[in-house]
């Protein structure tokens, strides 16, 4: 039986699509192709007769059509107006015609899709950050990635405006990365270039690692003080020292040589994230000992404070 | 007192490389990032880059990358700066500057600055 | 790179005149905006950071202020020894920028 491929099947606009004719009789003659699915002399788009290989436009030729010998018929730079059904008609010695017909669909060239973004910037559980995927396609699936990945499953994840736009709602430290939209149609896909969220954080309660000198777990005096603070956060963090509250230096290392017990007390390290407006410190008390004994490092409860 | 005191005036032919240096007293060398800042005659500032004196770290201005390069000598606490394929427009004032602390801080104290003339 | 843009490029005022000069960022500093006086002949020196942060020793008639992309560098009493030029840098990561400058001079 005499059937019809098309290939593809959904076509984008401006490509082109084979219709392919399968189980053609021995006894055949010629070949004539109609749009519709019907024969009608004001549909015919191209006759073609074997014997001459002389192929005839009709009135529905465009020339964008080329009939082949074995009676396919190529469409090139479709638009969505040949999408349909197309008929085959093909003509036997033996005036018995048979006919097929087979159709496609299609669909628009899908444009570079592009992420706005209400906040590139956001500080953690504070701010919501709305992604959207323009423009407006109808028919067309949206799809988000974020560094390369399919979205995770997250109760602070959501999807809205047929997937149009992607909240992230009271964002994290690990929300941060690379995000691109995809839209696609059946015929086709296309991908945003990558927007970055840089999720502003911080900053977290700081510590404090003593690093002595000479390596021992007690502060005799004589030995050098290296106290090193750290904290997360982005941007970095401000740091700044006070001995027994007396405003220090403004670097993640404090050192001092050759402690004494004049240097007892309490050292605090202070930490600061103008971005996020967010503060944080803590302290640790230090004793020296005189002679042999070895007091050692205590850490005091640290305290932090959020404007 | 913190003092950064730079190496005298130079001056070099088009296409040759000069090395500033800047000796660092009055304070812990490594605890604090070092920059280096230039500004040609009448006009205005222009960073370069900074050295981590602690680790040996660089990071440079996009404009100066490849013909710039910065190191350090913790034992003698001085900071070098080197500018390569010199062209007349790298004629400028070349100031060391020290960060007022780790991490997004400005610059509090500067060198005196060393005069360098690029000419044929 | 972040563009740092100063008005007025120059000015001139009495002494004891309130002086105001603006830096705008191109993208949110966050208050990471730091101002120098530049004497002439000398080396820049640092005024205020963080905005609004005075160095020690520097005399309370200067002040700053602003937030986001916008801010101001104020002299509340102009003296003949401010005459300078004044430069706004931000100091949130690197490549720090610097303003292109404000040359302040007495009437």
């Known amino acids: 039986k005499l059937t019809i491929e098309s290939t593809p099947f959904n076509v984008a606009e401006g490509k082109e699509v084979l219709l392919l004719a399968h189980n053609l009789p021995q006894n055949r003659i010629g070949y004539s192709w109609y749009k519709g699915e019907r024969v009608d002399g004001n549909s015919l788009i191209v006759g073609y007769v074997i014997g001459t290989q002389q192929a005839t436009p009709g009135p529905a030729y465009s020339g964008r059509e080329t009939i082949y010998p074995n009676a396919s018929l190529l469409i090139q730079n479709v638009t969505q107006n040949d999408t349909g059904f197309y008929t085959l008609q093909v003509i036997k010695s033996d005036l018995v015609n048979e006919e097929a017909t087979g159709q496609f669909h299609v669909y628009p060239e899908l444009p570079k899709p592009s992420i706005s973004s209400n906040n590139s910037n956001p500080v953690e559980d504070k701010d919501a950050v709305a992604f959207t995927c323009e423009p407006e396609v109808q028919n067309t699936t949206y799809l988000w990635w974020v560094n390369g990945q399919s979205l995770p499953v997250s109760p602070r994840l959501q999807l809205s405006n047929g997937n149009m736009t992607l909240t992230l709602l009271s964002v994290k430290r690990n929300d941060a990365g690379s995000y691109e939209c995809e839209i696609q149609n059946p015929a086709s896909a296309n991908r945003s270039d990558p927007v970055t969220l840089n999720v502003l954080y911080g900053p977290d309660v700081p510590t404090i690692s003593p690093i002595i000198s000479p390596p021992d777990s007690s502060y005799l005096s004589g030995a050098n003080l290296n106290l090193s603070c750290h904290s997360a956060s982005n941007p970095s963090p401000q740091y700044s020292w006070r001995i027994n509250g007396i405003p220090q230096q403004h670097t993640q290392v404090l050192f001092i040589a050759k402690i004494t017990p004049n240097n007892n007390g309490t050292y605090a390290c202070f930490v600061s994230n103008l971005a996020t407006g967010r503060n944080n410190s803590i302290v640790k008390s230090i004793t020296v000992s005189a002679s042999g004994t070895s007091p050692g490092l205590s850490a005091g409860a640290h305290h932090h404070h959020h404007h | 007192q913190v003092q950064l005191v730079q190496s005298g005036a130079e001056v070099k032919k088009p296409g040759a490389s000069v090395k500033v240096s800047c000796k660092a007293s009055?304070?812990?060398?490594?605890?604090?990032?070092l920059h280096w800042v230039r500004q040609a005659p009448g006009q205005g500032l222009e960073w370069i880059g900074y050295?981590?004196?602690?680790?040996?770290?660089?990071n440079y201005a996009q404009k100066f990358q490849g013909r710039v390069t910065m190191t350090r000598d913790t034992s003698t606490s001085t900071v070098y700066m080197e500018l390569s394929s010199l062209r007349s427009e790298d004629t400028a004032v070349y100031y060391c500057?020290?960060?007022?602390?780790?991490?997004?801080?400005?610059?509090?104290?500067w060198g005196q600055g060393t005069l360098v003339t690029v000419s044929s | 790179d972040i563009q740092m843009t100063q008005s007025p490029s120059s000015l001139s005022a009495s002494v004891g005149d309130r002086v105001t000069i603006t830096c705008r960022a191109s993208?949110?500093?966050?208050?990471?905006l730091a101002w120098y006086q530049q004497k002439p002949g000398k080396v820049p020196k640092l005024l205020i950071y963080?905005?609004?942060n005075l160095v020690e020793g520097v005399p309370s008639r200067f002040s700053g202020s602003g937030s986001g992309t916008d801010f101001t560098l104020t002299i509340s009493s102009l003296q003949p020894e401010d005459v300078a030029t004044y430069y706004c840098?931000?100091?949130?990561?690197?490549?720090?920028?610097f303003g292109q400058g404000t040359k302040v001079e007495i009437k």
């Open positions: 500057a020290r960060e007022y602390g780790n991490y997004n801080y400005p610059l509090d104290y």
């Open positions: 009055g304070y812990i060398f490594t605890s604090y990032w």
């Open positions: 050295i981590n004196p602690q680790t040996g770290y660089t």
């Open positions: 993208e949110n500093q966050y208050g990471y």
């Open positions: 963080n905005t609004k």
């Open positions: 840098q931000h100091h949130l990561g690197t490549p720090y920028t």
